[in-house]
């Protein structure tokens, strides 16, 4: 129904705690420059103007749309021009194309530091003084880095930090309870940004029946209970959700995901019978909950999916009458069959059903073309599989550091010509998919693997858009989302790639490398992998290894020398002589 | 919607002609193979002919071949069948239909063949 105020209609909704948690985390997306007390500043205008709105609808101003409010905002800031460029250019035209234009000027790499976690006394003092204002801190320098983040869920993760927090503060040893709590917490936070994004890149570039169809398949394996209109209900509620935060409209879509969240709850009869659990929760963890709930149990009678898909001799006929809901229907069926498949396998299942339909329905004898259609997605279920089998066994035998150095190496072979630091961002990435899906039971490696993947590859393709430099990505990238992760995994050596001279200054270490943190020594360490690769990329995986030991070793020497300064600079040159012998 | 509605049919006498036509709506015609089948007094439906979407491709039964002609404009949205040499035995509704389908999903003409 339609509000006279839009602005008094979302507080209303939203409560103020909410209301102004999602306008900061707007603004943090839009200007990602800006510092926290200039957009708290303009977060607080706003809000006081929503309440005059509420005391009187009629009011001023009140009847303007949220994108003409919260644009003329952004627009009134001084310096504009200075501090974002061309993205004052936005502020010369008209809605809705200034929103588009904003949304344009999102920088999905942005330069600014990495968010660094104060020490924990130091946390818990200013957390103790204005809990209010250090939630404020965290949702702004997460939404500024990740301009896509899901605003409802960056709530939530907001939420879960202050009840960490709460906890750990009143501890005696506050880092020990902290640390562990909190690494949880951003592991969690940044998983939640990749997938995200990955949804609004569909969106943005294939459009909302794209998104659509991941829906159907998603929501058809968690619910297989759930009938195909139910599961058209919810795959197009979501579909305008992530369509409202993805196009920066983040009140209507807090909004509407938590009226989402209360239909599901209010009629779980229908969906599944494993959301009460979630359920029973406050607002924020009910909505976090249901988008991560477990599979509901099969239904044991399903018939065999030949049936209505091959066997029918009404095929074309159904296809042609209703193309979107026929192959939505195949979707479903197939999906609700299958929850150890990727969403993105499943999407590809599809896509060769559509593809094999076009084709045999146009012929005299439709029936007998079809009729192997189902045979034909053997190949197709059986490489991801096989890359699954691979990796995990890699990843057993190597660990997480040695499976990142393995696809740092296959990468900077199939990109070379790509930045180390975004290779050696992705190779840790993709290399983290170990940890978090190999340990799994079977059957939920697959589709935990699979759709990590894609949503990490989906990073390095935006990333590698700013700047394009290898035709290898840009040739897997183009196309559809669901096929880019075969495609990278079957690229190989980039044959076309003057190897890189090798410089002695890019291998050349010295004592501050010892006091880092382990993460920064394996970075550091991994930089040297890629350039070694870039160096030689048909170096053998000995040769590699020869090296990375022989370099391992010598960084332990040294680190561990009473003299570290000399041992850096007479023990080095001798490891760089070492290193071009061995990959001579 | 989908919609086909099918014409010419009529009474005729052994060894005359008749040419049925199909008018097809509501999909892209083009991209879609298209069939006739019949249907006689107190029998089950019965395949005729077959036509792939561009027109290169046709498929008769037994029954047909060497007096059926299988046709399609799809300029026109419109599928054809030329029966010359009709026998009694052809009498039966005939019915245009998608793809490789037998089934009825539209009214159909009648044929009668008699002397």
């Known amino acids: 129904e339609a509000h006279k105020s839009e602005i008094a209609h979302r507080y209303n909704d939203l409560g103020e705690q909410h209301f102004k948690g999602l306008v900061l985390i707007a603004f943090s997306q839009y200007l990602q420059k800006c510092s926290y007390d200039e957009h708290a500043k303009l977060v607080q205008e706003v809000t006081d103007f929503a309440k005059t709105c509420v005391a009187d609808e009629s009011a001023a101003n009140c009847d303007k749309s949220l994108h003409t409010l919260f644009g003329d905002k952004l627009c009134a800031i001084p310096n504009l021009r200075e501090n974002y460029g061309e993205l004052a250019d936005c502020c010369t035209k008209q809605e809705p194309e200034r929103n588009e234009c904003f949304l344009q000027h999102k920088d999905d790499n942005p330069s600014l530091p990495p968010f660094e976690r104060p020490e924990a006394e130091a946390m818990c003092t200013s957390f103790k003084e204005n809990p209010t204002t250090f939630m404020g801190h965290y949702l702004h320098e997460v939404a500024r880095r990740h301009p896509y983040f899901y605003a409802p869920e960056l709530l939530y993760y907001a939420e879960q930090y202050n009840e960490i927090l709460t906890q750990c503060c009143a501890e005696a040893d506050k880092e020990s309870c902290l640390t562990p709590k909190l690494d949880g917490v951003k592991e969690k936070a940044l998983v939640s940004s990749v997938r995200q994004r990955m949804k609004c890149s569909s969106m943005q570039k294939f459009g909302e029946r794209a998104f659509k169809a991941w829906a159907v398949a998603r929501l058809s394996q968690t619910f297989p209970n759930a009938d195909f209109a139910e599961i058209t209900k919810l795959a197009t509620d979501l579909t305008k959700v992530n369509k409202e935060c993805c196009h920066g409209d983040l009140l209507e879509c807090a909004d509407d995901r938590a009226e989402l969240a209360k239909y599901m709850c209010e009629n779980q009869a229908t969906i599944s019978s494993k959301l009460q659990t979630c359920c029973d929760k406050p607002l924020l963890k009910k909505a976090h909950c249901l988008s991560e709930v477990e599979h509901d149990t099969m239904p044991a009678d399903l018939p065999a999916i030949a049936a209505d898909f091959v066997e029918d001799q009404e095929v074309c006929k159904n296809y042609a009458e209703a193309k979107d809901v026929f192959l939505g229907t195949f979707l479903y069926e197939y999906s609700r069959r299958h929850p150890d498949y990727s969403v993105s396998l499943l999407l590809r299942l599809a896509k060769k059903y559509e593809a094999t339909l076009e084709k045999c329905c146009a012929e005299a004898n439709p029936p007998a073309c079809y009729g192997t259609v189902l045979a034909e997605f053997q190949p197709l279920v059986e490489e991801p599989k096989n890359l699954v089998k691979t990796n995990c066994d890699l990843y057993e035998k190597l660990g997480e550091y040695g499976f990142q150095n393995a696809i740092l190496v296959r990468y900077t072979q199939k990109a070379p010509q790509v930045s180390t630091p975004t290779l050696v961002e992705a190779a840790r990435n993709l290399g983290r998919v170990g940890t978090k899906c190999c340990t799994l039971p079977e059957d939920q490696r697959l589709p935990c693997v699979e759709d990590y993947l894609s949503a990490i590859l989906n990073r390095v393709c935006l990333l590698h858009e700013k700047t394009p430099v290898s035709e290898h990505v840009t040739k897997c990238c183009s196309g559809s989302l669901v096929e880019r992760r075969p495609c990278f995994s079957a690229l190989t050596v980039d044959e076309t790639y003057v190897p890189k001279e090798f410089k002695a200054e890019t291998f050349t270490f010295h004592s501050d490398i010892c006091t880092l943190p382990e993460k920064e020594k394996q970075i550091k360490k991994q930089t040297a992998l890629a350039e070694l690769v870039k160096h030689k990329p048909k170096a053998t995986a000995e040769q590699l290894k020869t090296v990375m030991d022989d370099f391992a070793q010598f960084l332990d020497t040294c680190c561990k020398a009473a003299d570290k300064d000399t041992c850096f600079s007479t023990e080095g040159p001798n490891l760089v002589t070492r290193c071009k012998d061995a990959l001579a | 919607k989908v919609q086909l509605v099918e014409s010419g049919g009529g009474l005729v006498q052994p060894g005359n002609s008749l040419r049925l036509s199909c008018a097809a709506s509501?999909?892209?015609?083009?991209?879609?193979?298209m069939s006739w089948v019949r249907q006689a007094p107190g029998k089950g439906l019965e395949w005729v002919s077959s036509?792939?979407?561009?027109?290169?491709?046709?498929l008769y039964a037994d029954s047909a071949k060497g007096r059926f002609t299988i046709s399609r404009d799809n300029s026109k949205n419109t599928l054809y069948l030329q029966m010359n040499s009709l026998r009694p035995e052809d009498t039966a509704v005939y019915y245009c239909?998608?793809?490789?389908?037998?089934?009825?999903s539209s009214q159909g003409t009648l044929v009668t063949v008699s002397s």
């Open positions: 509501g999909f892209t015609f083009s991209s879609f193979g």
């Open positions: 239909t998608i793809g490789g389908s037998l089934s009825r």
């Open positions: 036509i792939s979407g561009s027109g290169g491709d046709t």
